[in-house]
């Protein structure tokens, strides 16, 4: 039975040209995290493998930095970066947990962080 929950940074906004940290945290489970995949729709951004380290997709290599922790830093944001991002935790023995973050990239300088929320 999967007992874990994923806490994410929820709905967030950031300024065009700036950077943002995407963070997820898996709690309430003793399952071992073997890998975390970061995706935007069907595009892979990065994978953090517990044994092998980070793999950043070549499409994002110049704009994505690993960390902090299992999170991901998106740099040089454009309005095209607006959309849903997913952290997919591969765990043993539980299986897969998915968290969702919605990022809005704003033209103006008024960019505030949204509230945290949890996905069971």
């Amino acid at each position: 039975m999967m007992t874990g929950t994923i806490e994410t940074t929820g709905n967030i906004s950031a300024e065009k040209g700036g950077s943002i940290i995407l963070q997820c945290h898996l709690s309430s489970t003793t399952a071992q995290v073997t890998q975390v995949n970061w995706e935007q729709q069907d595009q892979l951004l990065a994978i953090c493998n517990a044994d092998l380290g980070w793999h950043i997709s070549p499409s994002f290599k110049d704009r994505v930095a690993p960390g902090p922790g299992l999170g991901l830093t998106l740099q040089s944001l454009t309005v095209n970066d607006t959309g849903e991002y997913f952290c997919i935790y591969h765990t043993y023995p539980d299986g897969t947990y998915t968290g969702r973050i919605f990022l809005e990239v704003l033209e103006s300088s008024v960019a505030e962080h949204g509230a945290r929320f949890q996905i069971p």
Epitope: Q35, D42, Q43, L44, N49, L52, H55, S59, H90
Partner: antibody
Framework: EVQLQESGPGLAKPSQTPSLTCSVT????????WNWIRKFPGNKLEYMGY???????YYNPSLKSRISITRDTSKNQFYLQLNSVTTEDTATYYC??????????????WGQGTSVTVSS | DIVMTQSHKFMSTSVGDRVSITCRAS??????IAWYQQKPGQSPKLLIY???YRYTGVPDRFTGSGSGTDFTFTISGVQAEDLAVYYC?????????FGGGTKLEIK
């Protein structure tokens, strides 16, 4: 130029535990990760597992109770041991190198393969 | 495990033709796909990684595309030396898994 060369017993009897060796030249095994893959008669490829630059191992769960991957960095070799073989383990065994940071799970340097036939 | 399905075990083509090999994943694998070529008597060679990126030294007649569950590997202007078995592989999650292979035959 990196070269990988597999060697093994060629023939094994059912229930035996053959050991295969992959000798790496032109590159230090203390970087990247090092894989075993086998190809069955009829072209099916099966990923068996890896040993990482740090010595951490991953085994395909379908083989987990029977497989062991070890290394000797002083000899620049890594090894595959498969316990309790049956005729179903008859295959060509390949070792291959991966660079997770740049290529993820895509493996780009392969040995020529060594054939193992299990027969009584 | 993620199952990779290459629906054609064999494909026949002529020199100069364009040929496309398809691969379907049993669940979404984003763009974590590699394509390999295995010529008779040789070991597999990496051609494409991250679904669409050519590995170093791979001729530009080889291209890959797709994301999610459906992927295509295309050879534009097939040459006689392209006779081989072509495999897709996913590395979205462990264990990495391969398609069953598509054998390209040259008429």
């Amino acid at each position: 130029e990196v070269q990988l060369q597999e060697s093994g017993p060629g023939l094994a009897k059912p229930s035996q535990t053959p050991s295969l060796t992959c000798s790496v030249t032109g590159y230090s095994m203390t970087s990247d990760y090092w894989n075993w893959i086998r190809k069955f008669p009829g072209n099916k490829l099966e990923y068996m597992g890896y040993i990482s630059y740090s010595g951490r191992t991953y085994y395909n769960p379908s083989l987990k109770s029977r497989i062991s991957i070890t290394r000797d960095t002083s000899k620049n070799q890594f090894y595959l041991q498969l316990n309790s073989v049956t005729t179903e383990d008859t295959a060509t065994y390949y070792c291959a190198r991966g660079d997770y940071s740049n290529y993820g799970g895509a493996m780009y340097d392969w040995g020529q393969g060594t054939s193992v036939t299990v027969s009584s | 495990d993620i199952v990779m399905t290459q629906s054609h075990k064999f494909m026949s083509t002529s020199v100069g033709d364009r040929v496309s090999i398809t691969c379907r994943a049993s669940q979404g694998v984003s763009t974590t796909i590699a394509w390999y070529q295995q010529k008779p008597g040789q070991s597999p060679k990496l051609l494409i990684y991250s679904a669409s990126y050519r590995y170093t030294g791979v001729p530009d007649r080889f291209t890959g595309s797709g994301s999610g569950t459906d992927f295509t590997f295309t050879i534009s202007g097939v040459q006689a030396e392209d006779l081989a078995v072509y495999y897709c592989q996913q590395y979205y999650s462990s264990p990495f898994t391969f398609g069953g292979g598509t054998k390209l035959e040259i008429k």
